[in-house]
Interface confidence: low
């Protein structure tokens, strides 16, 4: 059985006496201690089961060593059942036990929910000891109570290596509402239907559950906690928030925004962070998400020149890393860049718009008609060729680069000379004779350098030869010609 | 992109205790709304939800499986973990993960499933 | 806890058809069911949440409607691929799935 008692009831005895049909058969008041009357017969039968053998909690001692009579079974005294107060209120309950003093070494824990209760908690144990018996009164103080107090309590006895166990004290903390699920922020399509949940605990129980929103009472009726709420839409934000009632009182829960997702704002701050011939680095600030995530970016690229058509190229992109290069641009060109980024509900405008250049492109193609003679008097080869037809965007003319490779028995060396923009002729000075020399020409510019030209190849003889016909650039398609002398 | 993805032993003998874990990416159980739960189809039957946690460590448990079952996770490993106890021949299925809708907004259904552990329970 | 009833647990349609599954709830769901799809050796895939709104990606084809305890799943013009078991979820309180309906292909 258990009694119950209430804070706002009169106050209740530490020890009240016997409960109907418990087994307690002492009944002096624990408050007069020291004390104690009668002893209890050695078999107890349960209340529960009349004529079954009881052995919960209780210990049934031996004979003395006179042998002359039976101990008591040992078992706490029923106490106060359970506990009802408000949080921060201070609580103090008690155990109480009879031992008969040829027990030595008893001890008295408390332990909450099956865990026993150690360090710094308010428990103290008295022993009122008379001529045949020792009445122990443990008692526990919490001073504060909060919910996390709640719970059931018991006392434990070792004695003679048995266990000796209370029946339980249920201590339950009444307060405000605690939410356990508050409604959370949310960015919502418009006009489309989402929910919102509320939960709170007591106790005391039932909790009820009203919804606010933008300040005005949603439900006119409460809902038992928890609650969810759905919204059929909304066609601007809006903030909700939910009471929670009980009998103690009212807790109101933190105000959500609900949020409408709208398409992105523009992107801002669109920055060159470098250029070549045929590429552009940018990067952006990105614009409001519009309360959706960006989903992806494009990038849009007119030529700004009054020959081009005044097409718009496109490059999509993900919307993170907030950077782009755009690729296949013409070289020495001028280029006007806006970015627009999309959400789930569409594209943003775009950015404003910025101007960039590409750089000087090397050359895209190579020097034309190149020849080689052998000038075997003065040991050279004498280099002709004539200057390629490029492009405005490859820039200016700075020069040439000349590859010479001289092979003979499993030897191959390559040589490179520079030689200015005005310049269509050459002359290098023989490296190896009775070997053949392979002659190769770019043209440069600020941007690079182009294309080689395609080889050329002329057979250098042993000292003492004649002067023969030049070679030089073969036809497309043609085996590249070898003089032979 | 969300996956999800059971292991398991595989076989187990009757009264013995299942462990499973669920391991995920593209998401993150530390992102308030998100919840993952475990749901089972025995050989032949229906879908059976198990377990849900919660974000915050809150833990949902089917009523007539409860005192059976654990769920916990580990928030930084992407892993969410069940545990049963005393499994017999009724406990042979499919187990799934499954994560809760992405918005933080309850009630929530599953929108992404893994591919599912295969348990058989031998007596 | 809430139950759902699922019925048919199965039935046979020809292509280009249509079929209809209906779930009953034990109590009031506020609409907050949703539809999946599951293949042998894949995991359930969703189709429909909140009664009738369709996960992006599914084709129209598939389509839901219902309000209370009352709730019903159409597949309209039946292809091949739609060879597969159907389950109801409610989440109003916790999550319960219905029995399940296997579709077959004439």
């Known amino acids: 059985a258990i009694t119950e008692a209430r804070e706002e009831a009169k106050p209740y005895p530490l020890f009240p006496g016997p409960l109907p049909g418990s087994l307690q058969t002492d009944h002096t008041s624990l408050l007069s201690l020291p004390h104690t009357s009668g002893y209890q017969p050695a078999l107890m039968f349960s209340p529960t089961q009349p004529g079954r053998p009881y052995t919960g909690n209780v210990a049934i001692p031996r004979v003395t060593s006179a042998g002359s009579k039976l101990l008591p079974p040992l078992a706490f005294k029923h106490t106060v059942g359970h506990i009802i107060l408000s949080e921060h209120k201070d609580v103090k309950f008690n155990c109480s036990i009879s031992v008969p003093n040829i027990y030595q070494d008893t001890t008295i824990s408390w332990w909450k929910d099956g865990k026993e209760l150690l360090g710094a908690h308010h428990a103290i144990t008295q022993f009122y000891p008379d001529d045949e018996v020792t009445a122990i009164i443990a008692s526990f103080s919490i001073t504060s109570v909060q919910r996390s107090d709640n719970g059931s309590y018991i006392c434990k006895m070792k004695i003679n290596n048995e266990e000796i166990v209370s029946d339980p004290i249920y201590i339950e903390v009444q307060g405000l509402p605690h939410f356990t699920k508050q409604p959370e922020s949310m960015n919502v399509t418009r006009n489309t239907a989402f929910n919102l949940t509320c939960q709170a605990v007591g106790p005391p129980e039932p909790v009820n559950i009203f919804w606010v929103q933008n300040s005005s009472r949603v439900n006119e009726q409460p809902e038992k906690s928890p609650s969810v709420l759905t919204v059929p839409g909304l066609t601007e934000m809006a903030v909700f928030s939910c009471e929670a009632h009980n009998d103690k009182g009212l807790t109101v829960s933190k105000g959500v925004q609900i949020n409408i997702k709208a398409i992105p704002s523009p992107p801002t701050e669109v920055s060159i962070h470098n250029s070549t011939a045929h590429s552009i680095l940018i990067s952006w600030v990105p614009g409001f998400d519009g309360y959706s995530p960006f989903r992806n970016c494009s990038v849009q690229v007119k030529e700004v020149d009054p020959l081009s058509n005044g097409s718009v190229m496109i490059f999509n992109t993900s919307a993170s890393p907030h950077m782009y290069q755009i690729k296949q641009l013409q070289a020495l060109a001028n280029y006007s860049i806006g970015v627009s980024c999309m959400n789930e509900i569409g594209w943003s405008a775009v950015s404003p718009w910025i101007l960039a250049s590409t750089t000087e492109g090397a050359p895209s193609v190579a020097p034309l008609n190149v020849t080689v003679f052998l000038n075997e008097s003065r040991d050279n080869v004498d280099i002709r060729w004539m200057k390629p037809l490029t492009k405005r965007q490859a820039g200016e003319l700075v020069g040439y680069r000349i590859s010479h490779v001289w092979q003979s028995a499993g030897i191959s060396k390559e040589l490179l000379e520079e030689v200015g923009q005005n310049n269509s002729r050459a002359q290098i000075s023989v490296q190896v004779h009775n070997a053949t020399c392979t002659v190769r020409i770019a043209a440069v510019t600020k941007g690079g350098v182009g294309p080689f030209s395609d080889p050329v190849k002329i057979f250098i003889p042993a000292h003492g030869w004649v002067d023969h016909a030049p070679s030089s650039t073969p036809a497309p398609g043609n085996a590249d010609p070898v003089l032979i002398i | 992109q969300v996956t999800l993805k059971e292991s398991g032993p595989g076989m187990l003998q009757s009264s013995q205790t299942l462990s499973l874990t669920c391991s995920f990416s593209g998401f993150s159980l530390s992102t308030s709304g998100m919840g993952v739960s475990w749901i089972r189809q025995p050989s032949g039957k229906g879908l059976e939800w198990l377990a849900h946690?919660?974000?915050?460590?809150?833990?949902r448990y089917n009523t007539s499986l409860q005192s059976r079952l654990t769920i916990s996770k580990d928030t930084s490993r992407n892993q969410v973990f069940l545990k049963i106890t005393s499994v017999d021949t009724a406990d042979t299925a499919t187990y799934f993960c499954?994560?809760?809708?992405?918005?933080?907004?309850?009630?929530?259904?599953?929108?992404?499933w893994g591919q599912g552990t295969t348990l058989t329970v031998s007596s | 806890d809430i139950q759902m009833t699922q019925s048919p647990s199965s039935l046979s349609a020809s292509l280009g058809g249509k079929v209809t599954i209906t779930c009953k709830a034990s109590q009031d769901i506020h609409k907050h069911i949703a539809w999946y799809q599951h293949k042998p050796g894949k995991g359930p895939r969703l189709l429909i949440h909140y009664t009738s709104t369709l996960q992006p990606g599914i084709p129209s084809r598939f389509s839901g409607s219902g309000s209370g305890r009352d709730y019903s799943f159409s597949i309209s013009n039946l292809e091949p691929e739609d060879l597969a078991t159907y389950y109801c979820?409610?989440?109003?309180?916790?999550?319960?799935f219905g029995g399940g309906t296997k579709l077959e292909i004439k």
């Open positions: 946690i919660y974000w915050d460590d809150d833990k």
């Open positions: 979820l409610q989440y109003d309180n916790l999550w319960t």
């Open positions: 499954g994560r809760l809708g992405a918005y933080s907004a309850f009630p929530y259904y599953f929108d992404y």
